[in-house]
Interface confidence: low
């Protein structure tokens, strides 16, 4: 069972939010869908096949940033009915290609700041147990991806974390993995890929909303980042 990275996005009534999603590869349909209560299916909200769900027309935009391996979905004129569970994804099958779960909460008043809210203790960067150790669910490989930085990156194969010559195509804003080669042995953590844009964002410390100049209100943080499949984000 693949456990999706999960992020929480909060916005104010009438405001807007930007949802950041991993862009696994070029030339594939990408989408944001909304999970339907009861049915368990995920209905497309917006996709690159020019589909926009009726109730989002005129207030949703999808922008691709292929060099950053990232796509953004902005939803404006937020209403309380926009609150719910969404998912980013890639591929022709909306239900099967999900790469990230997004919980959107639209509220009428915005709390002052992250700092003024009681927050659970955030894990320390150096003390997360799976940073430099083999987790129980990891493969037997003892190599970590060693990434080099060619000026231009061609399309490369998907991530297969069982190989010591892992290739990574994903490079969202937060994670600058680009192409190739596993030439030096190191402790290997195969549980995540560089595609975890939103699972990484806000991972270690909550953000203040002011950083996002695209939206009036935007907070996005990781809820779960410990059990992700090495092939997530591949669609």
């Amino acid at each position: 069972l693949r456990i999706l990275p999960e992020v929480k996005v909060e916005g104010e009534l009438g405001g807007s939010v930007t949802i950041k999603c991993p862009l696994p590869e070029m030339h594939v349909r990408i989408y944001l869908c909304r999970e339907m209560a009861g049915s368990g299916t995920c209905g497309t909200v917006v996709s690159t096949t020019n589909f926009i769900k009726a109730e989002y027309k005129g207030r949703v935009t999808l922008k691709q940033y292929p060099r950053k391996n990232l796509f953004l979905v902005e939803v404006t004129q937020l209403t309380e009915s926009d609150s719910g569970v969404y998912a980013c994804g890639a591929g022709m099958n909306t239900d099967r290609g999900k790469t990230q779960k997004v919980t959107l909460n639209v509220h009428s008043e915005y709390e002052p700041s992250w700092e003024e809210q009681p927050m659970p203790e955030t894990p320390k960067w150096f003390h997360l147990p799976y940073l430099f150790q083999m987790p129980a669910y990891a493969s037997s490989s003892k190599f970590v991806t060693r990434v080099t930085t060619p000026a231009q990156r061609g399309k490369v194969p998907p991530v297969h974390h069982s190989s010591p010559t892992t290739q990574i195509t994903h490079r969202p804003r937060v994670s600058r993995a680009s192409s190739v080669a596993g030439d030096k042995p190191r402790t290997f953590l195969p549980s995540t890929t560089a595609s975890k844009i939103s699972a990484l964002e806000g991972l270690l410390k909550p953000q203040t909303p002011s950083y996002n100049h695209h939206t009036r209100l935007h907070r996005q943080r990781a809820l779960d980042y410990g059990s992700q499949s090495g092939r997530e984000g591949q669609g």
Partner: antibody, heavy 124, light 105 residues
Framework: QVQLQQSGAEVRKPGSSVNVSCKAS????????ISWVRQAPGQGLEWMGR????????TYAQKFQDRATITADISTSTVYMDLSSLTSEDTAVYYC?????????????????WGQGIMVTVSS | ILSQAPLSLSASIGDSVTITCRAS??????LNWYQQKPGKAPKLLIY???SLQSGVPSRFIGSGSGTDFTLTISSLQPEDFATYYC?????????FGQGTKLEIQ
């Protein structure tokens, strides 16, 4: 607030290696990644590589991909950068910096906290 | 590749100066500006092309998007005389401009 404390000056002979360190203190929970940037005397800044912990991936500038190795020691909250096959052109000040592209400073995507720098001299 | 201009600049206290940074290809707004004084580590001034880093005086103004960016310092103060670098974080391999040395006239 995070502080990055770097090790002392180093002198090495051509062909040898140097290992420089960068110890994080303070609010290490706000560190998303650490980059290494160097500056030769009278020259500009040159990014060498970075380590980001989740997932544990090291990324290197092409120029350094065969000679640089960045590692981290969780027990001491220290990041290391090893540079091998040194030549006189590697004489420089080596800085570590918080690579502010995740965690609390996602939007910045910049180096906002720097170590004080380590002077590495390569001379025969 | 980032190209800064001018590479050297003389000005007087109270002047307004502009430093430009041109990217060989679009870097969107992933462009940062740093100030460095002799013997010191660089200091982040502007991130994301135009956002002022916390604690930096408002006389530092960044603008631009795509390939052309500017750093303007209005009403120069004595402590502003330093070297300024632009840096892009759009591509995997971060790069810096050559630097602009701002000297007192």
């Amino acid at each position: 607030q995070v502080q990055l404390q770097q090790s002392g000056a180093e002198v090495r002979k051509p062909g040898s290696s140097v290992n420089v360190s960068c110890k994080a203190s303070g609010d290490t929970s706000s560190i998303y990644a650490i980059s290494w940037v160097r500056q030769a005397p009278g020259q500009g800044l040159e990014w060498m590589g970075r380590i980001n912990p989740i997932p544990r991936i090291t990324t290197y500038a092409q120029k350094f991909q065969d000679r640089a190795t960045i590692t981290a020691d969780i027990s001491t909250s220290t990041v290391y950068m090893d540079l091998s096959s040194l030549t006189s052109e590697d004489t420089a000040v080596y800085y570590c910096a918080r690579d502010c592209s995740g965690g609390s400073c996602f939007r910045q995507d910049a180096f906002d906290i720097w170590g004080q720098g380590i002077m590495v001299t390569v001379s025969s | 590749i980032l190209s800064q201009a001018p590479l050297s600049l003389s000005a007087s206290i109270g002047d307004s100066v502009t430093i430009t940074c041109r990217a060989s290809q679009s870097v969107s707004d992933y462009l940062n500006w740093y100030q460095q004084k002799p013997g010191k580590a660089p200091k982040l001034l502007i991130y994301a092309a135009s956002s002022l880093q916390s604690g930096v005086p408002s006389r530092f103004i960044g603008s631009g998007s795509g390939t052309d960016f500017t750093l303007t310092i209005s009403s120069l103060q004595p402590e502003d005389f330093a070297t300024y670098y632009c840096q892009q974080s759009y591509t995997t391999a971060y790069t810096f401009g050559q630097g602009t040395k701002l000297e007192i006239q």
